[in-house]
Interface confidence: low
């Protein structure tokens, strides 16, 4: 059986304050 494709793949960008308020770095969001 084919598994349903997960459309909630992560998008990762270098960002400051996006994932954590004092961190600059790669931040991944689904």
């Amino acid at each position: 059986r084919r598994r349903r494709r997960d459309t909630h793949f992560p998008i990762c960008i270098f960002c400051c304050g996006c994932c954590h308020r004092s961190k600059c770095g790669m931040c991944c969001k689904t």
């Epitope: 994932c19 954590h20 308020r21 004092s22 600059c24 770095g25």
Partner: antibody, heavy 122, light 107 residues
Framework: QVQLVQSGDEVKKPGASVKVSCKAS????????ISWVRQAPGQGLEWMGW????????DYARNLQARVTMTTDTSTSTAYMELRSLRSDDTAVYYC???????????????WGQGTTVTVSS | EIVLTQSPGTLSLSPGERATLSCRAS???????LAWYQQKPGQAPRLLIY???SRATGIPDRFSGSGSGTDFTLIISRLEPEDFVVYYC????????FGGGTKVEIK
């Protein structure tokens, strides 16, 4: 080496304002946030607030937010904390500290300034 | 606001003994957001432990941290003379708060 150097001690009268500076060196200033912490004589540590050096976002302790302003000057890698309408119970040592992150978790206030004593007295 | 309660307020022990310091949170704290500091008289605090159990750079292995949820512990396995100072726990949630501190004194 990584360090935070604060401005000198201050004596102020009640009702006045004080502005303490915190100059960073040895790391990329805009990649980290700065928290300010104070300690009244013989007392514990009180967190005052935070500023993101990269975007100027702030988060202030509820009991101080009406009187405190935190800013940064990225051209000189310096953070500032201004406290207005000073009272005698604002007499304390004021510290700036770098807020560290390691992967996905908070890695503590990992670098501290030497402290600035602010005395409020008439 | 998360309130951190440290106990005991003062701990009286002898050099070489084991010290157990407790930090209890008023609500659950992610282990990733719990840190411990040491403060010597007249000095700025120094980071000891972050992420509840990770030692900061240069911290001797006699210091260790553990815990999760609302209960966290700092253990000093063998007290050295320079360890008889004040220790604070601190959490980072929506904002940052410190515990009231534990003073470790010589018995």
């Amino acid at each position: 080496q990584v360090q935070l150097v604060q401005s000198g001690d201050e004596v102020k009268k009640p009702g006045a304002s004080v502005k303490v500076s915190c100059k960073a060196s040895g790391y990329t200033f805009i990649k980290y946030g700065i928290s300010w912490v104070r300690q009244a004589p013989g007392q514990g540590l009180e967190w005052m607030g935070w500023i993101g050096a990269f975007n100027g976002n702030t988060d202030y302790a509820r009991n101080l937010q009406a009187r405190v302003t935190m800013t940064t000057d990225t051209s000189t890698s310096t953070a500032y904390m201004e406290l207005r309408s000073l009272r005698s119970d604002d007499t304390a040592v004021y510290y700036c500290a770098r807020e560290g992150w390691n992967d996905d978790y908070f890695s503590g206030l990992d670098v501290w300034g030497q402290g600035t004593t602010v005395t409020v007295s008439s | 606001e998360i309130v951190l309660t440290q106990s005991p307020g003062t701990l009286s022990l002898s050099p070489g003994e084991r010290a157990t310091l407790s930090c209890r949170a008023s609500q659950s704290v992610s282990s990733n957001y719990l840190a411990w500091y040491q403060q010597k008289p007249g000095q700025a605090p120094r980071l000891l432990i972050y992420g509840a159990s990770s030692r900061a750079t240069g911290i001797p292995d006699r210091f260790s941290g553990s815990g999760s949820g609302t209960d966290f512990t700092l253990i000093i396995s063998r007290l050295e003379p320079e360890d008889f100072v004040v220790y604070y726990c601190q959490q980072y949630g929506s904002s940052l708060t410190f515990g009231g501190g534990t003073k470790v004194e010589i018995k």
